[in-house]
């Protein structure tokens, strides 16, 4: 039993940490998700492929401070936000600039977090409180995942159905024997 997924101020979805080898996709308003054009079928494209490995999606860098109550990280952390659109890898690199952005094939593929990494961060607190060490899990890479019709209909099921399900719990680190940690964590930038 654990906390469910939540949506934070940066609008990314973070699954219950450590629970999913393949975390659920981001929630977003993607008009392609329930497209009714073409009789509900994805539009044909000359580069269409059945092999997910041939698709890729953009990894956008996202920098933020992490907090715990009034305590804030000494340095911002950087993670990836997975862009919602997937396209053939050979088209992605310069496609936007040339105006040849590949049209996503309906709900078939989704850009989702692939790997996570843990980063130890030092939180500095006001009022002379001792710093607090935390380990935050950050998105390290993204991948395209083929979604079945079942996925499309149920992909929201893992996210809180109860009203107001923001973020999760927290805790300060005890202060005893933490000098070493404090030093190390002040050097926690990538």
């Amino acid at each position: 039993q654990g906390w469910q997924a939540f949506k934070n101020d940066a609008t990314e979805i973070i699954p219950e940490l450590g629970e999913y080898p393949e975390p659920p996709p981001e929630l977003e308003n993607n008009k392609t998700m329930n497209r009714a054009e073409n009789g509900g079928r994805p539009p044909h494209h000359p580069f269409e492929t059945k092999d997910v490995s041939e698709y890729s999606c953009r990894e956008l860098h996202f920098t933020r401070y992490v907090t715990d109550g009034p305590c804030r990280s000494a340095k911002p952390v950087t993670e990836l936000v997975c862009s919602g659109q997937c396209g053939p890898a050979r088209l992605l690199p310069n496609a936007i600039g040339r105006g040849k952005w590949w049209r996503p094939s309906g709900p078939d593929f989704r850009c989702i977090p692939d790997r996570y990494r843990a980063q130890r961060v030092q939180l500095l607190c006001p009022g002379g409180e001792a710093p607090r060490a935390r380990k935050v899990r950050l998105v390290a890479s993204c991948k395209c995942k083929r979604l079945t019709r079942f996925h499309n209909q149920s992909e929201l099921k893992d996210f809180g159905t109860e009203a107001a399900r923001p973020q999760k719990g927290r805790k300060p680190r005890p202060r005893a024997r933490s000098a070493k940690a404090n030093q190390a964590e002040l050097e926690n930038a990538y």
Epitope: G18, Q167, K171, P174, K180
Partner: antibody, heavy 121, light 106 residues
Framework: EVQVQQSGPELVKPGASVKLSCTAS????????IHWVKQRPEQGLEWIGR????????DYAPKFQDKAIMTADTSSNTAYLQLRSLTSEDTAIYYC??????????????WGQGTLVTVSA | QIVLSQSPAILSTSPGEKVTMTCRAS?????MHWYQQKPGSSPKPWIY???NLASGVPVRFSGSGSGTSYSLTITRVEAEDAATYYC?????????FGAGTKLELK
């Protein structure tokens, strides 16, 4: 699937020591802090301390500073709690739990099933 | 250390009733977690960060509060809710738990 499995019950004599284990599956303990909590029979919960399995650094509640030692073996993905100089006051269930932090809150989504330690002559 | 006082210690109610239990902190805390524990089981995360329900927790449960006063409310108690509920803070070291409120059904 994330699971935290603890070792079986222990019956120990006063003055002796005991070492409890907490084995994680579905995640790498190096990526998280591991906490230990004590619950005496029919009583509430007491926080013992927190361990960083990655480097062995530990923090203890003042009450347990001289009673408990937390360690870990990352190769077996296992955390340990050693209790020394046991008395009847140490008879309790000991839980290990995983600390999660999402960038805004710290919380404990996964707990072990607990290990009952009985101190009796 | 911050002491958490839970009241009442024992809450006796009937199915369908609305109940509220409180947790008062000796100093202000940023948020509160709640756990449910049934005999023979480990504590289960129940409400986190004051008002957010853990996975699988029925919507009849809710949490609220700020500063030194927090509460857990069940709108319509059901038999399966019989358990002991603990509040927990870590706004200040060491992490502390309340002594618990035992919910009994008549």
């Amino acid at each position: 699937e994330v699971q935290v499995q603890q070792s079986g019950p222990e019956l120990v004599k006063p003055g002796a020591s005991v070492k409890l284990s907490c084995t994680a599956s579905g995640f790498n303990i190096k990526d998280y802090f591991i906490h230990w909590v004590k619950q005496r029979p029919e009583q509430g919960l007491e926080w013992i301390g927190r361990l960083d399995p990655e480097d062995g650094e530990s923090d203890y509640a003042p009450k347990f500073q001289d009673k408990a030692i937390m360690t870990a073996d990352t190769s077996s993905n296992t955390a340990y709690l050693q209790l020394r100089s046991l008395t009847s006051e140490d008879t309790a269930i000991y839980y290990c739990e995983r600390e999660d932090y999402d960038g805004t809150y710290t919380f404990f989504p996964y707990w072990g099933q607990g290990t009952l330690v009985t101190v009796s002559a | 250390q911050i002491v958490l006082s839970q009241s009442p210690a024992i809450l006796s109610t009937s199915p369908g009733e609305k109940v509220t239990m409180t947790c008062r902190a000796s100093s202000s805390v940023y948020y509160m977690h709640w756990y449910q524990q049934k005999p023979g089981s480990s504590p289960k995360p129940w409400i986190y960060a004051t008002s957010n329900l853990a996975s699988g927790v029925p919507v009849r449960f809710s949490g609220s509060g700020s500063g030194t006063s927090y509460s857990l409310t069940i709108t319509r108690v059901e038999a399966e809710d019989a358990a002991t509920y603990y509040c927990q803070q870590w706004s200040s070291d060491p992490l502390t738990f309340g002594a618990g409120t035992k919910l009994e059904l008549k």
